[in-house]
């Protein structure tokens, strides 16, 4: 039975040209995390595998940095980076947990971080 929950940074905004940390946290389970995928709607950004370490998609190598922790840092943001991002936690024995973050990249300097929220 899957008892865990994923807490994410929720809806966030950042300035064009800046950077942002995408962060998820799995709680309320003793399941072992064996891999975390970071995905966009149509492509993989990065994988952190317990045995293999980090893999960053070549499309993002220049502006994606692994971490902190199991999170992902996006740099040199453009308006095209606006959209959904997903963290997928592969765990044993529970299975797969998914968290969603919506990032809005703003032209102006009024970017503010949204509230944190939980995805069961």
């Amino acid at each position: 039975m899957m008892t865990g929950t994923i807490e994410t940074t929720g809806n966030i905004s950042a300035e064009k040209g800046g950077s942002i940390i995408l962060q998820c946290h799995l709680s309320s389970t003793t399941a072992q995390v064996t891999q975390v995928n970071w995905e966009q709607q149509d492509q993989l950004l990065a994988i952190c595998n317990a045995d293999l370490g980090w893999h960053i998609s070549p499309s993002f190598k220049d502006r994606v940095a692994p971490g902190p922790g199991l999170g992902l840092t996006l740099q040199s943001l453009t308006v095209n980076d606006t959209g959904e991002y997903f963290c997928i936690y592969h765990t044993y024995p529970d299975g797969t947990y998914t968290g969603r973050i919506f990032l809005e990249v703003l032209e102006s300097s009024v970017a503010e971080h949204g509230a944190r929220f939980q995805i069961p």
Epitope: N37, Q43, S57, I88
Partner: antibody, heavy 119, light 107 residues
């Protein structure tokens, strides 16, 4: 339980356009994070992904078929559709609808509908 | 597009034997490979995702391994109901692409 069911005309003539329907039960096609895809399987078993409509309504096509493909949906009926134009005999295949997860894998499939393009 | 190559169209085996099917990607796909089973007259069924993770309800005689470009799907002890065609799929990027399939049959 999630179920998908395809329907279509079966036989169409070359150069015509076909319209296939996928009816989904057990989940709304507007449920967050899922993509609703079309995949075809040629005689000889080769599988080809055609495209999807996302829960939000955005659509992505396989570039190799994009010029001939239209995917739409009817959310009140919980159906999505594939329209494929300028048909040739090479489009003869079984056409499947499937649910696609965030990981881009297909966890639920319909039983498929056979399309034969012949004069 | 990423090309997925299953070099064997057929694999002959005895019931109870171990059988391994290989799949090669044309570029590094990390661990983003899935495996499907298709029995005659049925639609494909998801067995493995992310190279080695069993989908819900899949028996533990089915395992997957590999990373980068080389992947293996193994049935540890083939049962009669496992006779089917098995496909790999990369779920790394768009367009999603499949291998040509490997049919597991009895000797």
């Amino acid at each position: 339980d999630v179920q998908l069911q395809e329907s279509g005309p079966g036989l169409v003539k070359p150069s015509q356009t076909v319209f296939l329907t996928c009816t989904v039960t057990g989940i709304s096609i507007t449920t967050g994070n899922y993509k609703w895809s079309w995949i075809r399987q040629f005689p000889g078993n080769k599988l080809e992904w055609i495209g999807y409509i996302y829960y939000s309504g955005t659509i992505t096509y396989n570039p190799s078929l994009a010029s001939r493909t239209t995917i739409t949906r009817d959310t009140p009926k919980n159906q999505f559709f594939l329209e494929l134009s300028s048909l040739t005999a090479e489009d003869t295949a079984s056409y499947y609808c499937a649910r696609e997860t965030v990981l881009r894998v297909f966890d639920y499939w319909g039983q498929g509908t056979t399309l034969t393009v012949s004069s | 597009d990423i090309v997925m190559t299953q070099s064997h169209k057929f694999m002959s085996t005895l019931l109870g034997d171990r059988v391994s099917i290989t799949c090669k990607a044309s570029q590094d796909v990390s661990t983003a490979v899935a495996w499907y089973q298709q029995k005659p007259g049925q639609s494909p069924k998801l067995l493995i995702y992310s190279a080695s993770y069993r989908y819900t309800g899949v028996p533990d005689r089915f395992t997957g391994s590999g990373s980068g470009t080389d992947f293996t799907f193994t049935i540890s002890s083939v049962q009669a109901e496992d006779l089917a065609v098995y496909y790999c799929q990369q779920h790394y990027s768009s367009p999603r692409t499949f291998g040509g399939g490997t049919k597991v049959e009895i000797k």
